[in-house]
């Protein structure tokens, strides 16, 4: 493993590896207090990795512990040799007890795939360590899983192609090792926010990679380009999906998470964002009628501009369990927006607004909002995020998304916010006014808005209600209706994905 990370701030607990570093502290006390090695752990515990076949959705049921060379537990718990087999692999832990997401995932898999074998890989004794030690244990756990799979392959009708390893955080790299070490190729590995520290930039054999399974799909929900990234930033699968850019997840801000909580810490925000990958995957299992779609894009900024809502040439895919296998792609970065909770699905729209004249714009960018009116529902007032700046005599592209299915769009209200929202903007407005006292009226002209739905791939053009009135200024609004040439559906593939 690459040990080049000098500072490991994991779950907001800082641990300095540099020589002579002070005793590490986190928001809730000393790191070694939190991540103590349980006394007499390594000597007396045999084995350190346990495989629990969850035969029932009932959490009270003990399931069956599988061990290589012992066929009886397979019979006792009716292991189905021809069915899909899921191995769920947890990650590093600050506690000796399973995190709550595990029950949700097991339950969702049982609900969705009633005949499947669901195996929990319990490596808590090796994961409940200092993070660095847990990282060094991932290889060992990967070997254990590979040995289990090699033994199962000796059984009649068991196919490695039916195996789906699902690893969260450090568990995603464990899955990678297992896929690497097993004789043959496992069908699929899903990496749920694979861990970043000590894996970012590592060699492909020392982390999850597309070589580890026939299909490797990855959800990245806690990546950071500044500070230390809890989740890995680099793409490590055939498809790598970055919900909400892969960083700030809705519903996980300090205000959202802490709410009225008196003793909350930043740790809860980290947990919320890191664990969001699991909940997105659970959502894909239990809300298969509400699939979320991701769109291939070179980077998050381009996606935020609304440039990347195409489904041509497999450029879009369902996320989570329903993802369509794409072996021909490697490290394909895909993006989507989501809601703050289940069901996470949103409806994406690309809005192309051609600004054909632009008066007295001054220094500050205008703040625009749109409201979309559809046959099923009307949207809330949605901000148009200006990623760079408004260009005149050019087509400006924006991404907007709604939480509800609006149906077919009928009209659009475009609003230019009047009053400045900050002292900084007010100051810029004032300076702008002083520098152009004779031209106080800021104005721009828009004739039409072209809209493309990411989910249906339909394209529509909206024209101003009054062809003579195309100007908009601060505090004013402009209404657009479907142009007479109305629906202009291109022959683009709709993101309808056959469910596995």
């Amino acid at each position: 493993m690459s040990n080049s990370v000098p500072l490991l701030c994991f779950w907001s607990l800082c641990y300095c590896f540099a020589a002579g570093s002070p005793v590490p502290f986190g928001p809730e006390g000393r790191l070694e207090d939190k991540l103590h090695k349980p006394k007499a752990t390594q000597t007396e515990v045999k084995p350190s990795v346990r495989f629990n076949l969850r035969t029932s959705k009932d959490p009270e049921h003990e399931g069956c512990y599988l061990s290589v060379g012992h066929s009886q537990p397979l019979e006792d718990c009716s292991f189905n040799m021809t069915a899909k087999t899921f191995f769920i692999i947890h990650g590093w832990t600050m506690s000796g007890i399973f995190e709550n997401w595990l029950h949700k995932l097991v339950s969702a898999l049982h609900t969705r795939e009633k005949d499947a074998n669901v195996v929990v890989v319990d490596w808590l004794p090796l994961a409940h360590q200092l993070y660095t030690d847990a990282v060094n244990n991932t290889r060992v756990v990967g070997h254990s899983i590979a040995r289990m799979l090699d033994w199962l392959q000796e059984k009649d009708d068991f196919s490695l192609g039916n195996v789906h390893l699902i690893g969260y955080s450090l568990g995603a790299h464990v899955a990678g090792y297992a896929g690497n070490f097993v004789k043959g190729t496992v069908g699929r590995i899903t990496g749920l926010d694979p861990a970043g520290p000590m894996f970012e930039g590592a060699d492909i054999h020392k982390r999850l990679s597309p070589d580890d399974a026939d299909f490797v799909d990855v959800l990245h929900t806690y990546t950071r380009s500044f500070g230390l990234s809890i989740g890995i930033q680099m793409p490590v699968g055939h498809i790598d999906i970055y919900p909400n850019g892969g960083d700030f997840q809705p519903g996980c801000g300090l205000n959202d998470v802490l709410g009225s909580i008196a003793y909350g810490t930043i740790t809860e925000v980290v947990k919320c964002e890191h664990e969001r990958a699991v909940h997105l995957f659970v959502d894909s299992l239990v809300n298969q009628d509400k699939p979320s779609f991701a769109f291939q894009c070179t980077d998050s900024n381009r996606f935020k501009k609304g440039i990347c809502l195409s489904c041509r040439k497999n450029r879009c895919n369902s996320i989570g369990y329903n993802a369509k296998k794409m072996r021909n792609k490697r490290n394909s970065k895909m993006y989507l927006k989501t809601r703050a909770g289940m069901p996470f699905r949103v409806y994406h729209y690309q809005m192309k607004i051609h600004v054909f004249s632009y008066k007295n714009m001054g220094e500050i960018e205008p703040t625009f909002y749109v409201t979309l009116y559809g046959t099923n529902a009307d949207s809330q007032t949605l901000p148009l995020e200006i990623v760079e700046r408004i260009e005149q005599n050019a087509t400006n592209t924006f991404l907007v998304y709604t939480e509800e299915d609006l149906g077919d769009l009928l009209k659009i209200q475009l609003t230019w916010e009047g009053a400045s929202q900050s002292w900084y903007n007010l100051w810029k407005e004032f300076r702008s006014y002083l520098s152009q006292p004779r031209n106080p009226g800021r104005e721009l002209n828009i004739r039409r808005i072209r809209v493309k739905s990411g989910e249906t791939q339909r394209k529509l053009t909206f024209c101003t209600e009054d062809p003579e009135n195309t100007s908009i200024s601060p505090g004013r609004e402009l209404w657009f209706r479907k142009c007479r040439d109305g629906w202009r559906m291109k022959n683009e593939t709709s993101p309808t994905v056959e469910l596995p």
């Epitope: 629990n52 506690s95 399973f98 808590l124 519903g251 709410g259």
Partner: antibody, heavy 119, light 107 residues
């Protein structure tokens, strides 16, 4: 039949320590987490912490981190909770409870151990 | 910490009535909510786990519903043996927490 048998009532002076036991039977002790819950007189329940008997890994409520220590003896299928630096605030009924496989819900509870701290 | 609020401290009902007890979480806890009954000088007894899953040996008149932040324990046709304290508990995140309890008493 699953049973959790707790040690008897304790009357102790402030500053003392006590170790409450919880002997499990009727299931594989190392397969389920054991949790401890405090109930002050006429009040609600407070989760103190949990232990994974398989290897001794623990999780504590921050509030009780300096008050309680959870341990197990696998050979006798017994869980222990030691409470230190006792004050009158620690007077309560303490329960051990067996977690489900994930440690979330508690289907079996001990009968409770009454702790009275008084000078 | 996640705060569980059981808004009704006491609920007075007549045997044979149907009753609903509520539990509200300070943040989304999905379905990680469990209900317990406790009679005087007894240990708590699990009634419903994971919001709606029934427990063997618990009468079918007890049922649970809800997800996210709002949860309900329903007792269809209350019997005299049902009187006592009812607590909700969350296992979504540590520390696990309990509601303040609702006392179900005879009217």
């Amino acid at each position: 039949e699953v049973q959790l048998q707790q040690s008897g009532p304790e009357l102790l002076k402030p500053g003392a320590s006590v170790k409450i036991s919880c002997k499990a039977s009727g299931y594989t002790f190392t397969d389920y987490t054991m949790h401890w819950v405090k109930q002050s007189h006429g009040k609600s329940l407070e989760w103190i912490g949990g232990i994974n008997p398989y290897y001794g890994g623990t999780t504590y409520n921050e509030k009780f981190k300096d008050k309680a220590t959870l341990t197990v003896d696998k050979s006798s299928s017994t869980a222990y909770m030691e409470l230190r630096s006792l004050t009158s605030e620690d007077s309560a009924v303490y329960y051990c409870a067996k977690g489900d496989y994930y440690g979330g819900s508690y289907n079996y509870w001990g009968q409770g151990t009454t702790l009275t701290v008084s000078s | 910490d996640i705060v569980l609020t059981q808004s009704l401290a006491t609920l007075s009902v007549t045997p044979g009535d149907s009753v609903s007890l509520s539990c509200r979480a300070s943040q989304d806890i999905s379905n990680s909510l469990h209900w317990y009954q406790q009679k005087s000088h007894e240990s708590p007894r699990l009634l419903i786990k994971y919001a709606s899953q029934s427990i063997s040996g618990i009468p079918s008149r007890f049922s649970g519903s809800g997800s996210g932040t709002d949860f309900t324990l329903s007792i269809n046709s209350v019997e005299t043996e049902d009187f006592g304290m009812y607590f909700c508990q969350q296992s979504n995140s540590w520390p696990y927490t309990f509601g303040g309890g609702t006392k179900l008493e005879i009217k």
